[in-house]
């Protein structure tokens, strides 16, 4: 199809070589058409456009994305670029930063239902550049955390070095939907709830004498609880003696609850004490058996192929540790009578 009639938008993605960040393109079809598509309609229900030339579908994934090869070859279906570029609803997600993502991307409805619809398309010229070291040293991260129940803020990474006074007007999106009231380089959250978690996009316009570009950044915002102030506790074994049968195989499970920590490095291991000696046992990998917002339960088993008389003289110790401290629980084996 002829893309000369498509509306054009220029975007700039300046990525940090230090972080694993992603980027998105929205299918910004001309305003009346957009309302049929991506549900990012800026119109209030009362502001119905006078005419709707594009009779699109309500199916959110009903747009087609293409990539325009730089050598002038025909347009390529974006699905050829899978899994580096992924379409979700009307949004194109770029999973890996790199200058090779620079180029032209075209979106249009899949279903062309009237002569007007042929020109119902958008061409996005994307320029991708690595961030120069000269730019801001302390720019906001592309992964930001908000503490549940407290106040917090979400900063636009590409503008975080500028003061609110000198910052240009910013357009914010959350999970692809326009946040129409937010216009500054920082979103202030009075009280953080779980629903504040999501993918935020901030856009602002940068102009030079020749043209203007939309500078875009993507921020993944996580809602978290505060770091625990407690060392882990062992939920199992509870008893310090265990009745066993000699000659039979035995599995002893150690289950421990670890409170949430942003930097989470849990330790759970088994060791054996035999008179004055003690040594760590090679046991199967630990596994997470339950994970909630506040804590995680991790299990690690020690397996004895068969219980011997010598095992009855030993103590089997489960050791767990986080950044706050450690806890141990020892088990003495006792022959079943």
């Amino acid at each position: 199809f002829n893309i000369s009639g498509c509306s054009t938008k220029k975007l700039l993605w300046t990525y940090s070589t230090r972080s694993e960040e992603e980027f998105v393109l929205f299918c910004d079809l001309p305003e009346p058409q957009k309302s049929h598509f991506c549900h990012r309609n800026r119109l209030s229900p009362k502001q119905v456009p006078e005419h709707l030339p594009f009779m699109g579908s309500n199916d959110l994934s009903d747009v087609q994305w293409y990539q325009q090869p730089s050598n002038g070859d025909p347009l390529e279906d974006i699905r050829k670029s899978y899994p580096h570029i992924i379409q979700d609803k009307c949004t194109l997600h770029f999973l890996t930063p790199g200058v090779n993502n620079s180029g032209s991307y075209i979106c249009r409805p899949k279903m062309i239902k009237s002569p007007y619809d042929v020109a119902c398309c958008v061409k996005m010229i994307l320029e991708v550049k690595p961030q120069t070291n000269a730019s801001c040293e302390y720019s906001a991260s592309h992964k930001q955390d908000l503490l549940l129940g407290s106040t917090g803020s979400i900063s636009c990474p590409s503008l975080s070095c500028q003061s609110d006074a000198q910052s240009p007007a910013v357009t914010w999106y959350k999970n692809g939907k326009l946040l129409s009231v937010e216009r500054s380089n920082r979103i202030v959250v009075d009280e953080v709830y779980d629903y504040h978690q999501g993918t935020y996009v901030c856009d602002y316009t940068q102009s030079d004498t020749v043209s203007s570009w939309t500078v875009r950044a993507v921020v993944q915002v996580r809602t978290i609880v505060g770091d625990t102030k407690l060392k882990p506790d062992i939920l199992d074994p509870v008893e310090d003696t265990l009745e066993v049968e000699l000659g039979k195989p035995l599995t002893i499970s150690c289950k421990a609850r670890f409170g949430f920590e942003r930097v989470f490095n849990p330790v759970i291991k088994w060791y054996i004490k035999d008179s004055d000696l003690e040594w760590e046992v090679s046991v199967p990998e630990a596994k997470s058996i339950k994970s909630t917002l506040k804590d995680e339960i991790i299990e690690r088993n020690i397996i004895l192929e068969k219980v011997t008389q010598r095992d009855l003289r030993r103590k089997f110790v489960c050791f767990v540790q986080n950044s706050i401290g450690n806890t141990t629980q020892s088990v003495q084996l006792k022959e079943k009578r």
Epitope: L60, S61, D88, K89, L95, Y195, Q197, T199, Q220, L293
Partner: nanobody
Framework: QLQLLESGGGLVQPGGSLRLSCAAS?????????MGWYRQAPGKGRELVSS???????NYVDSVKGRFTISRDNSKKTLYLQMNSLRAEDTAVYYC??????????LGQGTLVTVSS
């Protein structure tokens, strides 16, 4: 923290079928993300086999197109992979993970699929 737990792997003969499931621990995280199935064959790197967007759009690598079907149930916080016409080269550990979103990079512990006669 997001926990993903896969199930449904096993030993199957060439041409057979399996259905993998993956349960997530947080619904707020699950529904807005592009979720996917990765696999890692012995001695090879991990590859993204298929993904599904929050709106239901699906993608597959060429080697599984027409044989594998990905689906999701947001109300149950569960991701599925229906694998038909399985081949020996599909043998791998299959992981469910977040492809795009807040917990991008989070993976389950994996479920082994072995295709052998």
């Amino acid at each position: 923290q997001l926990q993903l737990l896969e199930s449904g792997g096993g030993l199957v003969q060439p041409g057979g079928s399996l259905r993998l499931s993956c349960a997530a621990s947080r619904s707020i995280t699950f529904s807005h993300n592009v979720m996917g199935w990765y696999r890692q064959a012995p001695g090879k790197g991990r590859e993204l086999v298929s993904s599904i967007g929050s709106g239901g759009s699906t993608n597959y690598v060429d080697s599984v197109k027409g044989r594998f079907t990905i689906s999701r149930d947001n109300s149950k916080k569960t991701l599925y992979l229906q694998m038909n016409s399985l081949r020996a080269e599909d043998t791998a550990v299959y992981y469910c993970g977040v492809v795009v979103g807040v917990y991008r990079g989070s993976l389950g512990q994996g479920t082994l699929v072995t295709v052998s006669s």
